[in-house]
């Protein structure tokens, strides 16, 4: 006898409003196998039973959440397989406040994800990003969870809000921050992003004279949330063009970090180098667009990056990583600007 369930996963995540069919079948050497689903509120028409198989149709309603069990029997032998079904809602409905940030002000940023299910802090995580890195120094205030006002009964969707107090954004300020919200489900990770532009002004308000505004810092750890083999990663970033900005380097904290130099001679070639003693290597880890489209040369403590074919460097963030240690330096290259080197 063979007993099969398709798809075979023991946990299945279904987007609200989408349908999924789970087929349970069994072959039987001695006659026809009896196969049926039990343990789910299966209203009429959601289960179709045929000789030797049974098809469970999930309609993507919250009431479909549960753990149905397929039972197959053939003579004196029986098999069963349970499937944990989780119906989720995670539309791209992020709202950020304020609409733009003002450098030099102690301010609070909020990010709200609307029409969410499940409303579980263990499933949903928020991050405040600068480029592809978590913004170091931001302080997370308490999260809020509220039920959305629904037109129809029986769909308890929620909105979840995370607020942060911002560190000093430095001078010059970065072009934008992003709120990233990640929903982690069985075998599925979903991500939405919303940009929070930073007001680029020559007359930014100064911080209170009781404080010293230090540059903002990027952590050197990746922002990927709980990504492991077998997970599908869906990222939905918003990436409008950044406003023009003079080059700005950022680095992870640490006693020694790589330096990035810009060289006009070779058609906007970037050089990353480390001078932290023997055995140190550097490599390019981030560039606007696809890093694979750039020409890279790596030689121990030095790594070059240039555009193919030779031409102006693309606007955006470039990142170089040093190993061992994992320290990174980030450089923002604007569209057309006189080159200089990182600090």
């Amino acid at each position: 006898q063979s007993f099969q369930v398709n798809p075979p996963e023991s946990e299945v995540a279904v987007a609200m409003g989408t349908s999924l069919q789970i087929t349970c079948s069994m072959s039987c050497d001695e006659g026809v196998a009896r196969v049926h689903w039990r343990g789910l509120d299966t209203s009429l028409g959601s289960v179709q039973t045929l000789p030797g198989s049974s098809i469970l149709s999930v309609r993507g309603m919250l009431s479909d959440t549960g753990t149905p069990v397929c039972v197959g029997s053939c003579g004196s032998r029986s098999f069963q397989h349970s499937v944990k079904i989780l119906v989720y809602a995670f539309p791209d409905q992020l709202v950020v406040s304020p609409e733009f940030l003002v450098p030099g002000q102690d301010q609070v940023v909020s990010c709200t994800a609307h029409n969410i299910w499940p409303a579980d802090p263990n499933s949903l995580s928020f991050a405040l990003l600068l480029g592809e890195q978590r913004l170091e120094g931001a302080q997370a205030l308490e999260p809020e969870q509220e039920e959305e006002i629904q037109e129809a009964e029986g769909t308890p969707l929620f909105r979840m809000t995370q607020r942060w107090r911002l560190p000093s954004l430095g001078t010059p300020a970065p072009p934008a921050l992003h709120c990233q919200v990640t929903m982690q489900l069985p075998k599925l990770v979903l991500t939405h992003r919303k940009e929070i532009p930073v007001l680029q002004s020559q007359t930014s308000p100064k911080p209170p004279n009781t404080t010293s505004a230090e540059p903002y810092i990027l952590t050197s750890s990746s922002t990927a949330e709980a990504v492991s083999t077998g997970l599908n990663i869906t990222t939905l970033p918003s990436a409008p063009p950044y406003p023009k900005l003079s080059p700005r380097t950022l680095s992870s904290e640490g006693p020694c970090r790589p330096k990035i130099h810009q060289d006009l001679e070779a058609g906007w070639e970037l050089l990353c180098e480390a001078s932290c003693g023997p055995g140190v290597t550097v490599r390019w880890t981030l560039a606007p667009g696809d890093l694979a489209t750039y020409h890279k040369r790596e030689a121990g403590a030095q790594a070059w990056l240039s555009v193919l074919p030779p031409g102006p460097m693309v606007e955006g963030w470039f990142q170089c990583r040093q190993d061992p240690g994992g320290e990174v330096t980030n450089l923002y290259v604007p569209g057309q600007v006189t080159p200089n080197s990182s600090s």
């Epitope: 170091e136 302080q139 997370a140 308490e142 607020r163 107090r165 560190p167 009781t210 404080t211 952590t219």
Partner: antibody, heavy 119, light 107 residues
Framework: EVQLLESGGGLVQPGGSLRLSCAAS????????MHWVRQAPGKGLEWISY????????YYADSVKGRFTISRDNSKNTLYLQMNSLRAEDTAVYYC????????????WGKGTTVTVSS | DIQMTQSPSSLSASVGDRVTITCRAS??????LAWYQQKPGKAPKLLIY???SLQSGVPSRFSGSGSGTDFTLTISSLQPEDFATYYC?????????FGQGTKVEIK
């Protein structure tokens, strides 16, 4: 000189109320978020509430939520903690503390005022 | 909430000793960690912020290190005025939380 000075502590019966004050001097009070932190006799420090510089944001530890209210009067450079429905476990030294803008650690603390809840 | 665990809870040391106190967070707090010193009947006093930055006016024998979940406060050469209770505090996310304290006593 930057200073914080708490007042208003005392002996109160369970279920009673008290209002603590914290007078600030030596800095631009409205620029700073402020906190209340308490310490029960022989115990460690417990953060209980904060308020933003413009009073737009407040938050409370679960242990005091619904019973305590934090407020401030920037014109008087004073922080307040209204404590209602007091319990024996609220007995502690109450400190006000200043929060460092952009970095968020508590860099200046008051000397504290003692609240005793007992019948 | 993020739990902060200090060790040891108390220690006995002599003047001139090198003293190390550790603090562990239940999840990463990056470098958003402060150390405070408190003497009996007094308010806490800030020693270290951002895990390793020395607060103005604090003697250089105090130093902090660590990031993520594991942090250390070191007193390189213990002085008579250093006998006190020391607390770590994370301010990465609310509610901010303190360690239970480490009492440094005279041997």
């Amino acid at each position: 000189e930057v200073q914080l000075l708490e007042s208003g502590g005392g002996l109160v019966q369970p279920g009673g109320s008290l209002r603590l004050s914290c007078a600030a001097s030596g800095f631009t009070f409205s620029d700073f978020w402020m906190h209340w932190v308490r310490q029960a006799p022989g115990k460690g420090l417990e953060w209980i509430s904060y308020i933003s510089g413009d009073s737009g944001y407040t938050y409370y530890a679960d242990s005091v939520k619904g019973r305590f209210t934090i407020s401030r009067d920037n014109s008087k450079n004073t922080l307040y903690l209204q404590m209602n429905s007091l319990r024996a476990e609220d007995t502690a030294v109450y400190y006000c503390a200043r929060d460092r803008p952009y970095y968020y650690y508590m860099d200046v603390w008051g000397k504290g005022t003692t609240v005793t809840v007992s019948s | 909430d993020i739990q902060m665990t200090q060790s040891p809870s108390s220690l006995s040391a002599s003047v001139g000793d090198r003293v190390t106190i550790t603090c562990r967070a239940s999840q990463s707090v990056s470098r958003s960690l402060a150390w405070y010193q408190q003497k009996p009947g007094k308010a806490p006093k800030l020693l270290i912020y951002a895990a390793s930055s020395l607060q103005s006016g604090v003697p250089s024998r105090f130093s902090g290190s660590g990031s993520g979940t594991d942090f250390t406060l070191t007193i390189s050469s213990l002085q008579p005025e250093d006998f006190a209770t020391y607390y770590c505090q994370q301010y990465k996310s609310y509610p901010v939380t303190f360690g239970q304290g480490t009492k440094v006593e005279i041997k």
